[in-house]
């Protein structure tokens, strides 16, 4: 399955619109700054695509959750907000196209579900800091700023598999 | 490869102005901040200011607020440090560095070779 | 603002001998604690970050431990190389700050 074209812009549109999302000055969160463990070996270039689709399917998935509470809600610009949803989902729609053509579709390696499970641990994980933070503006942008970081590492695997082809 | 590449050595009188710079490549130039460091003739490090080439947001050490600007240009990946009046006690090397902004991750890993700015009469 | 306090400001070691500098913050910054390495007419280079992570490259005999206020850097084994002057910095706050730095001399 050929993820299209326009895959890879929405990536960079998505991208985009995390960094006009910020709000306040970032230099008065130094302090909130967090280790979440992103699960960086799960997306190394060891997979082959059939185990990979699911994985960037499942970290997508886990960033629209986390940008569709009521708190997240409270914090970002409406009209930005349902713009990055409409890109979120178009790329969901994009990976799930794959797995009905038939990747990943047949017995699931189980590889491949412990690296869904750490993607799973590594968003808990981000809640639960977001919480214990109580969703203040500077434990947003630091989130906001993760979440930009392990998105485009995730893109540049999405790239490597498509020059790989 | 991750590179920061300062411009050159300046000799100058008191009073002039100058702008030096640091061309970040080899990564995405606004996913980082560039901090600035002095280090006097045998002295040690002092951390001037800092800058978030995405907005150009700033924010800068109380000892040198007001004496120097820092700026940058996302469009050709390069950040500057400026002087509108020189002073004899500006004399030292100065350094670039990237910093990952909020994220956990290595700060001031990559730094500039380093621009000397001399300033006598 | 934060002071950062290294000591010694300087030492005398002989190659193979095991060193220790010290780093004490003026309040509690966690671990948000880098050490740095100069040598003459070189840029700074980064050995250690967030007090206790080894900078990729930089040889294991390097290490760093601490967390609150008291920090350490600890080198196993000296190597002529190593001779240079320690920098500590803490990234908890802005204005960020710099020990005064240790200098390791051959004995």
């Known amino acids: 399955c050929d993820l299209p074209q326009t895959h890879s812009l929405g990536s960079r549109r998505t991208l985009m619109l995390l960094a006009q999302m910020r709000r306040i000055s970032l230099f008065s969160c130094l302090k909130d700054r967090h280790d979440f463990g992103f699960p960086q070996e799960e997306f190394g270039n060891q997979f082959q695509k059939a185990e990979t689709i699911p994985v960037l399917h499942e970290m997508i998935q886990q960033i629209f959750n986390l940008f569709s509470t009521k708190d997240s809600s409270a914090a970002w610009d409406e009209t930005l907000l349902d713009k990055f949803y409409t890109e979120l989902y178009q790329q969901l729609n994009d990976l799930e196209a794959c797995v009905i053509q038939g990747v990943g579709v047949t017995e699931t390696p189980l590889m491949k579900e412990d690296s869904i499970l750490a993607v799973r641990k590594y968003f808990q994980r981000i809640t639960l800091y977001l919480k214990e933070k109580k969703y203040s503006p500077c434990a947003w942008e630091v989130v906001r700023a993760e979440i930009m970081r392990s998105f485009s590492l995730s893109t540049n695997l999405q790239e490597s598999l498509r020059s790989k082809e | 490869e991750v590179q920061l590449v300062q411009s050159g050595a300046e000799v100058k009188k008191p009073g002039e102005s100058l702008k030096i710079s640091c061309k970040g490549s080899?990564?995405?130039?606004?996913?980082?901040?560039i901090g600035w460091v002095r280090q006097m003739p045998g002295k040690g490090l002092e951390w001037m200011g800092i800058?978030?080439?995405?907005?150009?947001?700033?924010a800068y050490s109380p000892s040198f607020q007001g004496q120097v600007t820092i700026s940058a240009d996302k469009s050709i990946s390069t950040a500057y440090l400026q002087w509108s009046s020189l002073k004899a006690s500006d004399t030292a090397m100065y350094y670039c560095?990237?910093?990952?902004?909020?994220?956990?991750?290595?700060?001031?890993?990559?730094w500039g070779q380093g621009t000397l700015v001399t300033v006598s009469s | 603002d934060i002071q950062m306090t290294q000591s010694p400001s300087s030492l005398s070691a002989s190659v193979g001998d095991r060193v220790t500098i010290t780093c004490r913050a003026s309040?509690?910054?966690?671990?948000?604690l880098n050490w740095y390495q100069q040598k003459p007419g070189k840029a700074p280079k980064l050995l250690i970050y967030f007090a206790s992570s080894l900078q990729s490259g930089v040889p294991s005999r390097f290490s760093g431990s601490g967390s609150g206020t008291d920090f350490t850097l600890t080198i196993s084994s000296l190597q002529p190389e190593d001779f240079a002057t320690y920098y500590c910095?803490?990234?908890?706050?802005?204005?960020?700050?710099f020990g005064q730095g240790t200098k390791v001399e051959i004995k």
């Open positions: 560095a990237r910093h990952p902004g909020l994220n956990w991750a290595p700060d001031f890993d990559y």
């Open positions: 309040q509690s910054i966690g671990s948000a």
């Open positions: 080899g990564y995405s130039f606004t996913s980082y901040w």
């Open positions: 800058i978030d080439p995405s907005d150009s947001d700033t």
């Open positions: 910095q803490q990234s908890y706050d802005f204005p960020l700050t």
